[in-house]
């Protein structure tokens, strides 16, 4: 999906209002310096592409993020504020959620959510030059 035509300001507002807090809740008890940010993005559409991938695509050691509150809100935000955000994407997230039976917070998931926090922060500062 091409995120170019999303309402970035509304998505940013949703992140600042609620999604960021849900991410912090998920990470509670983890030191902010515990993980190095290895995933980056260059502009807002690219950031949303990476955010969607990390949020909804299971990875080795962490197949369990799609049912978290921050993920549900991310999905809702994209469905409302990204015109034509495809049913394929939505259906893919549903499939990810069905595959998982119980909530398990692994260290790998914490690392992945730490990467997500970095991507969201980058999304909120689109004019900053890439390091």
């Amino acid at each position: 999906y091409d995120f170019t035509n999303c309402d970035f300001e509304k998505i940013k507002a949703a992140y600042l209002s609620t999604i960021s807090k849900d991410l912090i809740t998920y990470m509670s008890g983890t030191k902010s310096t515990e993980f190095n940010n290895t995933v980056s993005c260059s502009n807002r559409p690219h950031c949303l592409t990476e955010i969607q991938s990390l949020t909804f695509n299971p990875t080795a050691g962490c197949a369990s993020l799609a049912k978290e509150m921050f993920a549900m809100k991310t999905k809702a935000a994209l469905a409302i504020w990204c015109p034509g955000y495809s049913e394929t994407q939505i259906n893919a997230t549903q499939a990810m959620k069905k595959r998982r039976k119980r909530k398990v917070t692994t260290n790998k998931c914490l690392e992945q959510v730490s990467q997500l926090q970095g991507l969201w922060r980058r999304f909120n500062r689109p004019l900053l030059k890439q390091q």
Epitope: K10, A14, S17, T18, K73, A79, I80, E87
Partner: nanobody
């Protein structure tokens, strides 16, 4: 001004069904999604389900497979069909614009509709 009016609640036995309605004025599904939320006595308000104008839906784990959200765009009304009800579904049910939920609100919730599941 946006107005949302919930109805359809009542007393039902465990295993029973209810259908809630949310009539909206001042907002259309074209520009937002409608969601159902609930608040049980002594608990925080929680997300139940949402639907947008393309029929995309999402559900809380606790209701998936038992509740179905739908909408009639021509009537600007959202529905929540609740089947296989359990005592833990007892709560006041509210509808709201999903955008407001994402943005930390709504500041003013409607009166809601009470669902009591008890034998």
């Amino acid at each position: 001004e946006v107005q949302l009016v919930e109805s359809g609640g009542g007393l039902v036995q465990p295993g029973g069904s209810l259908r809630l309605s949310c009539a909206a004025s001042g907002v259309t599904l074209d520009t937002d999604a409608m969601g159902w939320f609930r608040q049980a006595p002594g608990k925080e308000r929680e997300f139940v389900a949402w639907i947008n104008n393309r029929g995309t839906t999402d559900y809380a784990d606790s209701v998936k497979g038992r509740f179905t959200i739908s909408a009639d765009n021509s009537k600007n009304t959202a529905y929540l069909q609740m089947n296989s009800l359990k005592p833990e579904d007892t709560a006041v049910y509210y509808c709201a614009r999903v955008s407001q939920w994402l943005l930390g609100g709504p500041a003013n919730w409607g009166q809601g509709t009470l669902v009591t599941v008890s034998s």
